[in-house]
């Protein structure tokens, strides 16, 4: 049994790090493999992750981690029974993929404005909470040529768009994703999209 592609891991910087790797041939990951991980820190304990299959030769493991902070470094050992297949390390703070924002809501009852709000995916005591900025993607299924990205670089998870900048009488969709500047993260996955109908009409000119 051999590792073809070594494990690579990303952390949500809250509670889960996901490691993926490829084996040299078809493998029943959960039956044949175990990924052991341990924080390099006093009084830490070794934890075991049971991997799942991810395609014929691919395996994925979701490592549960508590109180993830920048200095944390984990040792990783991939075992097949008594055979050590691979040994490595993982520093979560250097491989962060934030959680996707949630609860994206569109408020159209504000005069002349479309207000989009969403929730920060982290609790206030998480270190990413005050570091997230967002990208909001707005597009129209009725108008395939229309797709815009709005960068939200302030902390408040809201975006206001003048309704007059959108075509009247058609539907739009929006989704939002996040990244954390000071942690040099990748972008999160997109949130589920939400749909609304733009009924705004320009005031009739006299």
């Amino acid at each position: 049994m051999k590792v073809l592609q070594e494990p690579t891991c990303v952390s949500d910087y809250m509670s889960i790090s996901t490691c993926e790797w490829k084996m040299g041939g078809p493998t029943n990951c959960s039956a044949e493999l175990r990924l052991l991980y341990q924080l390099v820190f006093q009084s830490s304990e070794t934890h075991t992750c049971v991997p799942e299959n991810n395609g014929g030769v691919g395996c994925v493991c979701h490592l549960l981690m508590d109180d993830v902070v920048s200095m944390d470094n984990y040792t990783l050992d991939l075992w097949a029974g008594q055979q050590l297949l691979w040994k490595g390390s993982f520093k979560p703070s250097e491989h962060v993929k934030p959680r996707a924002p949630g609860n994206l809501t569109v408020h159209t009852n504000v005069s002349d404005t479309v207000l989009l709000t969403w929730s920060n995916p982290y609790p206030p005591d998480n270190y990413l909470y005050n570091d997230l900025t967002y990208a909001v993607n707005i597009w129209s299924e009725n108008d395939p040529a229309y797709s815009r990205i709005h960068n939200v670089t302030y902390l408040k998870p809201t975006l206001r768009i003048p309704a007059s900048t959108l075509k009247s009488g058609i539907s739009y969709r929006a989704r939002v994703r996040a990244w954390a500047q000071h942690y040099n993260t990748t972008w999160s996955e997109w949130s589920p999209s939400t749909k609304w109908y733009n009924s705004y009409r320009e005031p009739f000119e006299q």
Epitope: Q42, S43, S44, D66, D67, V69, M71, D72
Partner: antibody, heavy 116, light 111 residues
């Protein structure tokens, strides 16, 4: 919200032992390490040791090795620090603090006075 | 146990800026992250800065931290009377066995 509530002040004789408690609430108790530190009157902070509430494993500062014992009770989300063979220089405020490499939440402190 | 060196006291007038230094060595500050704590009279320490320069939620941006080589600095701008307190730097000594160490503490007086 996160709270660390420590037991009340103690007065002990030299040679005795003291056991200070720190009850945690507002978070998942076993998910965060707990440190103990102390501060003698008018002095700075001194680290004593750490306990991992998940499995109960500990690590102590060399200065206190053999004299300090840290334990936890997951049923009550409480950690304990026991210091034995007390001497007058152990008179200090003892703090529990949550965290790993730095400590974001602290108890209010427990004053232990060692006096004959 | 090694201790980080801080000036015993600093002072400045309200509205002014003050800096507090923290000096260590290659086995501690030079090889680890620095945190800063504020201790108001009669209270427990409070985390002000972690990771050399990051602020926890709720700490105003008047407080900032930096690190260069084996020393670190806490800067406080727009001083307020409520900032009068003791300030401690902290880091990890990575010599065996690793352990947290603190600075000697600096008393800030707002004139």
């Amino acid at each position: 919200q996160v709270q660390l509530v420590q037991s009340g002040a103690e007065v002990k004789k030299p040679g005795a032992s003291v056991k200070v408690s720190c009850k945690a609430s507002g978070y998942a108790f076993t998910s965060y390490y707990m440190h103990w530190a102390r501060q003698a009157p008018g002095q700075g902070l001194e680290w004593m040791g750490i306990i991992n509430p998940s499995g109960g494993s500990t690590s102590y500062a060399q200065k206190f090795q053999g004299r300090v014992t840290m334990t936890r009770d997951t049923s009550t989300s409480t950690v304990y620090m026991e210091l034995s063979s007390l001497r007058s220089e152990d008179t200090a405020v003892y703090y529990c603090a949550r965290g790993k490499w730095w400590w974001q939440y602290w108890g209010k402190g427990t004053l232990v006075t060692v006096s004959s | 146990q090694s201790v980080l060196t801080q000036p015993p006291s600093v002072s400045a007038a309200p509205g002014q800026k003050v800096t507090i230094s923290c000096s260590g060595g290659s086995s501690n500050i030079g090889n680890s992250y620095v945190s800063w704590y504020q201790q108001l009279p009669g209270t427990a320490p409070k985390l002000l800065i972690y990771d050399n320069n990051k602020r926890p939620s709720g700490i105003p941006d008047r407080f900032s931290g930096s690190k260069s080589g084996t020393s670190a600095t806490l800067a406080i701008t727009g001083l307020q009377t409520g900032d009068e307190a003791d300030y401690y730097c902290g880091t990890w000594d990575t010599s065996s066995p690793p352990q947290p160490i603190f600075g000697t503490g600096t008393k800030l007086t707002v004139l």
